[in-house]
């Protein structure tokens, strides 16, 4: 006869491990007992369980409540046992010793591998600002057994670096994603992907990038110079910019206070029916927590009675 077992049994933390040991005997052979022991190198054998043809299952005190026989029907030549709720400390070498009649004793070893799936965590780096050099966008850490694989999935251009820390029964892997921040990255997803044999599918953690920036400011509304004449209604100037975080707008007049009747509505400056009093230099001030920008325009309200055309100068300053 001969023993049938597995070289390696792999189980995920918390699952039940079936330790197989089947005696394929000749006709008339009987199994008297199957003794299971843990036999890690450098340590003495630690008895696990005894399956006896007459006495039944004995579980050693160290494994009380954790070792069972597989559910019926059972073959009397099957010495397999179930190790309930596998923990990392169960990982190691096991031996089944089968005493048969009349063939004598047989033994076989297997290795129990307990996979510890990782619980990854993603930590964003410092605030990203346009104009910075190579900056840490995020780091992703996952610890498991065996060591997990940590990669990144993103459309954003960047560089990665990984490091690994080995513990007694596991390994922690940390991967960092570095980039040169630009406004085009704002709102883009950066996804940490963790792969591990104990996971049915990759674990993914997504971080949305936030890059602080402030675009140059410009003023719209003076494109058609002929519209800026005395008596015109609905004239307005609009300040154009964009930023992260969204900027706030402030209007001032460089050569004096804003004329009465001029309404400030965020990025828009609304005028009452135009008079020559509305001529002047207007400044749009755009700011957010990252930066500030200015854009100024000169408004020259045209008197239709005069022959001279309206002159408009646009000046932008930062």
């Amino acid at each position: 006869g001969e023993l049938e077992t597995s070289d390696v049994v792999t189980v995920v933390l918390g699952q039940d491990a079936k330790l197989p040991c089947f005696y394929r005997g000749d006709s008339g052979e009987q199994v008297g007992q199957v003794a299971w022991a843990r036999v890690d190198a450098g340590e003495g054998a630690q008895e696990l369980a005894l399956l006896h043809s007459k006495y039944g299952l004995h579980v050693s005190p160290a494994y009380e409540g954790r070792v069972e026989q597989p559910p019926p029907p059972r073959n009397p030549l099957d010495g397999s046992v179930l190790l309930r709720n596998a923990v990392q400390a169960d990982e190691g070498e096991y031996e089944c010793r089968v005493s048969t009649f009349p063939a004598g004793s047989f033994q076989a070893r297997l290795r129990l591998r307990v996979l510890v799936p990782p619980l990854p965590s993603l930590n964003p780096g410092p605030a990203l600002e346009e104009g910075q050099g190579l900056t840490l966008a995020a780091s992703c850490t996952a610890e498991g057994s065996p060591a997990p694989s940590v990669t990144w999935d993103t459309e954003v251009k960047g560089t990665t670096s990984s490091r690994s820390f080995k513990h007694s029964r596991s390994a922690a892997v940390t991967s960092e994603f570095h980039l040169v921040p630009s406004r085009s990255m704002n709102g883009q997803p950066l996804t940490c992907v963790v792969s591990h044999p104990g996971l049915l599918q990759d674990q993914r953690i997504t971080h949305i990038l936030h890059v602080s920036f402030l675009a140059e400011a410009s003023v719209r509304g003076l494109e058609d110079q002929n519209l800026w004449h005395i008596g015109r209604e609905g004239a307005m100037l609009k300040c154009l910019s964009e930023g992260q975080p969204p900027p706030s707008y402030n209007w001032t007049r460089l050569d004096g206070p804003l004329p009465s009747g001029v309404r400030v509505d965020g990025d828009t400056l609304g005028f009452p029916p135009l008079t020559t009093e509305h001529s002047g230099i207007y400044v749009c001030h755009v700011s957010n927590e990252f930066s500030s920008r200015d854009s100024q325009v000169t408004v020259d309200v045209l008197d239709p009675q005069e022959d001279s055309g309206k002159q408009v100068d646009l000046v932008s300053a930062s």
Partner: antibody, heavy 126, light 107 residues
């Protein structure tokens, strides 16, 4: 025919010592675990100690641990129980017994006692 | 330690009677249970091992049953030589422990 014969019992004062012997014959002594079991007068049976075939594994009842020592000499087919620091509550008939050999090389369980000696009386009294 | 509780502690019966003695373990012991017979002034004698296996040379009127925690010794037809004290013993763990005994007396 399997035979187990105990000797060495007697009267001893509290704190004293005795060495019991058990001579085995009629079987291959070195193939079996052996045990000592005692029975106080008018009381039930109490397991005392067991020893593996080679003498490499020994088990003791908590009540005698540190005071009694089990040993064997396979060349003489003899089992021993060295009893020190004897107390009045150790007074009993001491039996040596052979363990049934149907569990192979597994120390966590004991097996039934299929052959017993006639017993030797140990009396601890001042 | 595993406690073994026998009942009854004593019983009176007549020759030919069917006698049943029970033994309960404080925790599961599979079939790691033996029954012994002891007559006054004599050493115990193994009757049943593995809860239900008859030891060689023991009359077939003796039988055992049970597994786990509850066990029974039955004498199908009591004979004069059966009047004695009976002990159960678990050998699932060290220390092996005995029941307190059941004395079978003549009615």
């Amino acid at each position: 025919e399997v035979q187990l014969v105990e000797s060495g019992g007697g009267l001893v004062q509290p704190g004293g010592s005795l060495r019991l012997s058990c001579a085995a014959s009629g079987y291959s002594f070195s193939d079996y675990w052996m045990s000592w079991v005692r029975q106080a007068p008018g009381k039930g049976l109490e397991w005392v100690s067991s020893i593996k075939q080679t003498g490499g594994v020994k088990h003791y009842a908590d009540s005698v641990k540190g005071r009694f020592t089990i040993s064997r000499d396979n060349s003489k087919n003899t089992l021993y129980l060295q009893m020190n620091s004897l107390r009045a509550e150790d007074t009993a008939v001491y039996y040596c017994a052979r363990e049934y050999s149907d569990v192979v090389d597994y120390v966590s369980v004991r097996t039934p006692l299929d052959y017993w000696g006639q017993g030797t009386l140990v009396t601890v009294s001042s | 330690d595993i406690q073994m509780t026998q009942s009854p502690s004593s019983l009176s019966a007549s020759v030919g009677d069917r006698v049943t003695i029970t033994c309960r373990a404080s925790q599961g012991i599979s079939s790691y249970l033996a029954w012994y017979q002891q007559k006054p002034g004599k050493a115990p004698k193994l009757l049943i091992y593995a809860a239900s296996s008859l030891q060689s040379g023991v009359p077939s009127r003796f039988s055992g049953s049970g597994s786990g925690t509850d066990f029974t010794l039955t004498i199908s037809s009591l004979q004069p030589e059966d009047f004695a004290t009976y002990y159960c013993q678990q050998h699932y763990t060290t220390p092996p422990t005995f029941g307190q005994g059941t004395k079978v007396e003549i009615k």
